[in-house]
């Protein structure tokens, strides 16, 4: 029977900068029941506080609700593992909520084949930002990425959409059924999970030739003229 091994705080995530959760990995239990507590202080503060909510985030977690989430403060936290034989502490982790945001996936992805008489056909997709994100405050800039593939293909084709919530793709294989997904990330932070797949059948008469693979400003439409060279660089096949 031994004191517990050193725990490790391995992840902190926020869905929207308004709340966040941190998770830790227990060390070895030393063969005895072990209690864990997370304590923290905000940078510049001389007091220590205990985790406000050990329940919401599941086992080995600490959840900070709205009333405990400060945007412009660094949190300094550590986990203490204790059993009858002694204690051990994790390393301190410094957390700034601004940099740990992982949003929910975008919502309401709709995909349509557009075949205008006077222009080349294209695949048009549109989506909404996740509901927890309030873009009106200006705290957030969300970037989007789309991926699609024929149903039976192994490889995804990925396109970077910048801040747009709609996108056009020209290069598709006629007669194929495609899966389309979208994900988002804040300017600082982590990519969301991919949205649930939306399926679209590309008509057999969908005209495609090599020159259509070029994405021009004209093809992208007025709303997408702000796309940068860096963004265009992301329009590649994976």
């Amino acid at each position: 029977q031994l004191p517990p091994g050193k725990p490790e705080i391995f992840k902190c995530r926020s869905p929207n900068k308004e709340t966040f959760t941190c998770w830790w990995r227990p060390g070895t239990d030393g063969g005895l029941p072990t209690n864990y507590s997370l304590t923290y202080h905000r940078e510049g503060e001389t007091l220590m506080h205990e985790c406000p909510d050990y329940i919401t985030g599941g086992p080995n977690s600490c959840h900070f609700g709205k009333q405990y989430t400060s945007m412009w403060r660094t949190y300094v936290m550590m986990v203490n593992a204790t059993n009858q034989m002694g204690s051990s502490f994790s390393d301190e982790l410094y957390v700034d909520v601004t940099y740990i945001v992982q949003p929910d996936p975008p919502l309401e992805l709709t995909v349509e084949v557009k075949q205008p008489e006077d222009r080349k056909p294209y695949l048009w997709m549109k989506w909404s930002p996740p509901t927890l994100i309030d873009l009106k405050t200006g705290w957030f800039t969300l970037l989007y990425e789309i991926r699609l593939k024929p149903e039976k293909a192994a490889e995804w084709e990925t396109h970077f959409a910048g801040q747009q919530t709609e996108f056009k793709i020209l290069s598709l294989h006629p007669g194929q059924k495609y899966l389309v997904q979208v994900r988002c990330k804040p300017d600082h932070g982590y990519w969301s999970a991919w949205s649930p797949a939306t399926f679209i059948q590309i008509p057999s008469d969908f005209i495609m030739n090599d020159e259509q693979k070029l994405i021009s400003e004209e093809d992208l439409g007025g709303e997408q003229k702000l796309i940068s060279e860096e963004d265009l660089h992301h329009h590649h096949h994976h």
Partner: antibody, heavy 121, light 107 residues
Framework: EVQLVESGGGVVRPGGSLRLSCVGS????????MNWVRQGPGKGLEWVSG????????NYAESVKGRFTISRDNARNSLFLQMNSLRAEDTALYYC??????????????WGPGTMVTVSS | EIVLTQSPGTLSLSPGERATLSCRAS???????LAWYRQKPGQTPRLLIY???SRATGIPDRFSGSGSGTDFSLTISRLEPEDFAVFYC????????FGPGTKVDIK
């Protein structure tokens, strides 16, 4: 309207006890750290005790540690201060005070009108 | 315990004048954790400024706060009749403490 109302003050002999109560209304009581602050007659403000909204660790000024006990009942939007072994220097107007956030150690943005405690033989 | 000292103890000014109140801490305070209050005679204190320079809800822009380290100040650009009162600074980086107050009275 956001408000706090204290009760339970009165006159007590040295060594006696009193229990102060505070009821909050017009806001989500369990979103805020809560505190007691006192002000002796003609004197300045002195923080007495406070704790975070989830009822975590309690915190006390050195002058009252071991004699006063703070507690709260979020279901009843209530904060309490049990005062034992009272001394003449505890004579003051006692304010129930809300912290701006979930932490008790924050700026105090809502104050009750206060309840007067007089310790005298 | 962090001790706060306020100066001057009393400030005698006329309505419309500018007032600058000082608050000094016994040790360095992160600027996120300093507040100012006004207490009019016979009334409860009211939060004016938090985080050294952020105005509380409903506080007019004649009040401004500044400072860092151990030296902080509250400036009232034009004194109104309701500003003749006692002003307290407070730190909340540790267990909260208040300064002894500065009384602003009419000259």
């Amino acid at each position: 309207e956001v408000q706090l109302v204290e009760s339970g003050g009165g006159v007590v002999r040295p060594g006696g006890s009193l229990r102060l109560s505070c009821v909050g209304s017009g806001f989500s009581f369990d979103d805020h750290g809560m505190n007691w602050v006192r002000q002796g007659p003609g004197k300045g403000l002195e923080w007495v005790s406070g704790f975070n909204w989830n009822g975590g660790s309690t915190n006390y000024a050195e002058s009252v540690k071991g004699r006063f006990t703070i507690s709260r009942d979020n279901a009843r939007n209530s904060l309490f201060l049990q005062m034992n072994s009272l001394r003449a220097e505890d004579t003051a107007l006692y304010y129930c005070v809300r912290g701006r956030s979930g932490w008790f150690n924050d700026a105090f943005d809502v104050w009750g009108p206060g309840t007067m405690v007089t310790v005298s033989s | 315990e962090i001790v706060l000292t306020q100066s001057p103890g009393t400030l005698s000014l006329s309505p419309g004048e500018r007032a600058t109140l000082s608050c000094r801490a016994s040790q360095t305070i992160n600027s996120n954790y300093l507040a100012w209050y006004r207490q009019k005679p016979g009334q409860t204190p009211r939060l004016l400024i938090y985080g050294t320079s952020s105005r509380a809800t409903g506080i007019p822009d004649r009040f401004s706060g500044s400072g860092s380290g151990t030296d902080f100040s509250l400036t009232i650009s034009r004194l109104e009749p309701e500003d003749f009162a006692v002003f307290y600074c407070q730190q909340y980086a540790g267990l909260p403490t208040f300064g002894p107050g500065t009384k602003v009275d009419i000259k």
